[in-house]
Amino acid sequence: QAKHKQRKRLKSSCKRHPLYVDFSDVGWNDWIVAPPGYHAFYCHGECPFPLADHLNSTNHAIVQTLVNSVNSKIPKACCVPTELSAISMLYLDENEKVVLKNYQDMVVEGCGCR
Amino acid sequence: QAKHKQRKRLKSSCKRHPLYVDFSDVGWNDWIVAPPGYHAFYCHGECPFPLADHLNSTNHAIVQTLVNSVNSKIPKACCVPTELSAISMLYLDENEKVVLKNYQDMVVEGCGCR
């Protein structure tokens, strides 16, 4: 039993992970001309009690994490993007014209517990 | 087996749930003078594919949800507070003086998939 517990993989805390999104994989290559994909990243990991400062949390997340520690029916805070940036994309409009547009909130720059 | 499947509770989509935090339950009653607790609320629920408009998501969340639909190793977007408000609390400072302070991001006003 002790060995089994040791073997249990420790979940890493909330952080940014690499993710390249190829538009052909998600069926967007029929309307996005360029780029063919982009580095989106994603957030994943534990939001453990107590929430450390680097987990970039809100007062509510701190309270919710505290409540979860005494009442597991209330979920822990969740690891999500807290800072996002834009990318430019060329897309085909309804007339098959190529249009350059800036798309907000496409790339994860930072993660946190919320 | 069919009955069992019917009985399986459908997970509801991301929304705000009631949560009253009693400061004595979380051990904060020794430094918070008033109020004795507050309605914090919390966010919980599915962020299903495709993300509906009311789920108040970002472009990144839409992309991540789409990626998850073709690659389940990438997690779905998470239901988190997207709008928070402040409350005022009386607390005891290090000199045992009662201080009134406004605490930001304490109450969930809205949830979304992020």
């Epitope: 190829d22 538009f23 052909s24 994989d25 290559n29 001309v33 360029a34 780029p35 063919p36 994909g37 430019s88 994309m89 060329l90 085909l92 007339n95 098959e96 014209k97 190529v98 249009v99 350059l100 | -």
Partner: antibody, heavy 121, light 108 residues
Amino acid sequence: QVQLQESGPGLVKPSETLSLTCTVSGDSISSYYWSWIRQPPGKGLEWIGYIYYSGSTRYNPPLKSRVTISVDTSKNQFSLKLSSVTAADTAVYYCARICSSTSCWGWFDPWGQGTLVTVSS
Amino acid sequence: EIVLTQSPGTLSLSPGERATLSCRASQSVSSSYLAWYQQKPGQAPRLLIYGASSRATGIPDRFSGSGSGTDFTLTISRLEPEDFAVYYCQQYGSSPLTFGGGTKVEIK
């Protein structure tokens, strides 16, 4: 510097499938779109289609039903297949690179030297 | 699709003269997404101009591009012997990508 070289049979019978390969040297095939363009003897240029290393393609609508462009990243090659050919498909076939970013998308540079494919029985 | 019409079909000039080639689009080319190429007999086309007015790497400054919307021009300020060739315009502001029919610049 990047160089492109077309290869394949110079003579194809009507109703058969034309198959050409473009070998890319001096650059990874993984960073750009790769295109096919053709030029009938004494005539102008016609874009056929392009591919990204992931397999994402876009084709010229009049040719779409007959065209398949594929990629082999391990060999740094991409290929063209044109089915049910007729004499009207006789042309010099060129492969070329298209930049895949928003700041430089859409023009062809560089080009292969071209290969003449004649459709005749 | 956008149809590109080049004029004149043939331009007969002497070395040292100025050449003005026209490319007219059947509809507006968005963001001046237009390129010019030079093709000599038995050779592949070579990129000269992209974005209507930007010279490609290694292209002499006697070549210049201008225009927007539906009317575009390639100008060769002083023709050199090696400039006698066929010139094509190409638009990439709409799908499918299309080329003009070409203008042949020949020695007078």
